[in-house]
């Protein structure tokens, strides 16, 4: 699941890695757009072994990762879900 | 406000069963990211983690117990469940009840409960 | 499993004295590692998280160092509600592990 949240709270992430984290070991991702009480983009992920790590927006595993998932978001196929909460 | 109440047995004998509950308020182990877990003190000595559970029953456990622990929760209850099987002088510790919520920054056991004092002697 | 090699095991000290705890990985945890702090007959308590970082409501006189795999706390200046165990926790693999503790008394 991808989710895109709008909040009103500090930065989340303390520390960002840029390893590389296969798809497969990934249940949620969560992007955290720049503004609202944090001066950067924050991608926060979910994997399955019960981790969470936040991870460097400029790394290119994860910037060729949300291309991926936006584009088959706008496909037909079955999609992972996009969740913008405004407060 | 979180809290965390561990129940259990004060004393038992060797080979027995030791069963624990622990029943918290203060949050639900139902939302995406919750867990519980059981960490246990010998008397002046250090922590040991155990087990924990999160919200989808993804259970986890410390390999050295691995054969004789078992996590379990009641979701609508708010409780979660500790089993050790065939116990020895060797587990006699407090054991405590904690909580982890996988939220950025995260803390795991970021809520304690007051710990239950467990003795095994024949 | 990760060991974590806590020292001292004990010690005593005076109240304005700088203290310092340490901490030693068996392999990269990449700060993923707390400092609890446990008084007499209580709870144990998160005070730094992420290897630097202070949880709420932790003095300032508390902070947290990583120096490769040695991951130490410092209080700066010792007061005497700080007389407590301390204990270390890596939860960058299961299982998590924790050092043997640091019994810190009043000299």
């Known amino acids: 699941v991808l989710e895109v949240y709008y909040t009103s709270l500090r930065c989340r992430c303390v520390q960002e890695s840029s390893v590389f984290i296969p798809r497969r070991f990934i249940d949620r991702i969560q992007i955290l757009p720049r503004g609202n009480g944090c001066p950067r983009k924050e991608i926060i992920v979910w994997k399955k072994n019960k981790s969470i790590v936040c991870v460097d927006p400029q790394a290119e595993w994860i910037q060729r990762m949300m291309e991926v998932l936006r584009k088959r978001s706008s496909s037909t196929l079955p999609v992972p879900v996009f969740k913008r909460k405004i407060p | 406000q979180v809290t965390l109440k561990e129940s259990g047995p004060e004393i038992l004998q060797p080979s027995q069963t030791l069963s624990l509950t622990c029943t918290f308020s203060?949050?639900?182990?139902?939302?995406?990211?919750?867990?519980v877990g059981w960490i246990r003190q010998p008397s002046g000595k250090g922590l040991e983690w155990l087990a924990n559970?999160?919200?989808?029953?993804?259970?986890y456990y410390n390999p050295s117990l691995i054969n004789r622990l078992t996590i379990s929760k009641d979701t609508s209850n708010n409780q979660a469940f500790l089993k050790i099987t065939n116990v020895d002088t060797t587990d006699s510790a407090t054991y405590y009840c904690?909580?982890?919520?996988?939220?950025?920054?995260?803390?795991?056991?970021?809520?304690w409960g007051q710990g239950v004092m467990v003795t095994v002697s024949s | 499993d990760i060991q974590m090699t806590q020292s001292p095991s004990s010690m005593s000290a005076s109240l304005g004295d700088r203290v310092t705890i340490t901490c030693q990985a068996s392999?990269?945890?990449?700060?993923?590692l707390v400092w609890f702090q446990q008084k007499p007959g209580r709870s144990p308590r998160p005070l730094i998280y992420?290897?630097?970082n202070l949880a709420n409501g932790v003095p300032s006189r508390f902070s947290g160092r990583r120096s490769e795999s040695d991951y130490s706390l410092t209080i700066s200046s010792l007061e005497s509600e700080d007389m407590a165990d301390y204990h270390c926790?890596?939860?960058?693999?299961?299982?998590?592990?924790f050092g043997a503790g640091t019994k810190l008394e009043l000299k």
């Open positions: 392999q990269d945890i990449e700060n993923d």
């Open positions: 904690v909580r982890s919520e996988l939220v950025m920054p995260y803390v795991p056991f970021d809520y």
């Open positions: 992420y290897a630097t």
């Open positions: 559970i999160w919200w989808d029953d993804d259970k």
């Open positions: 203060g949050f639900s182990l139902s939302p995406y990211g919750m867990g």
């Open positions: 926790l890596q939860f960058k693999q299961y299982p998590y592990t």
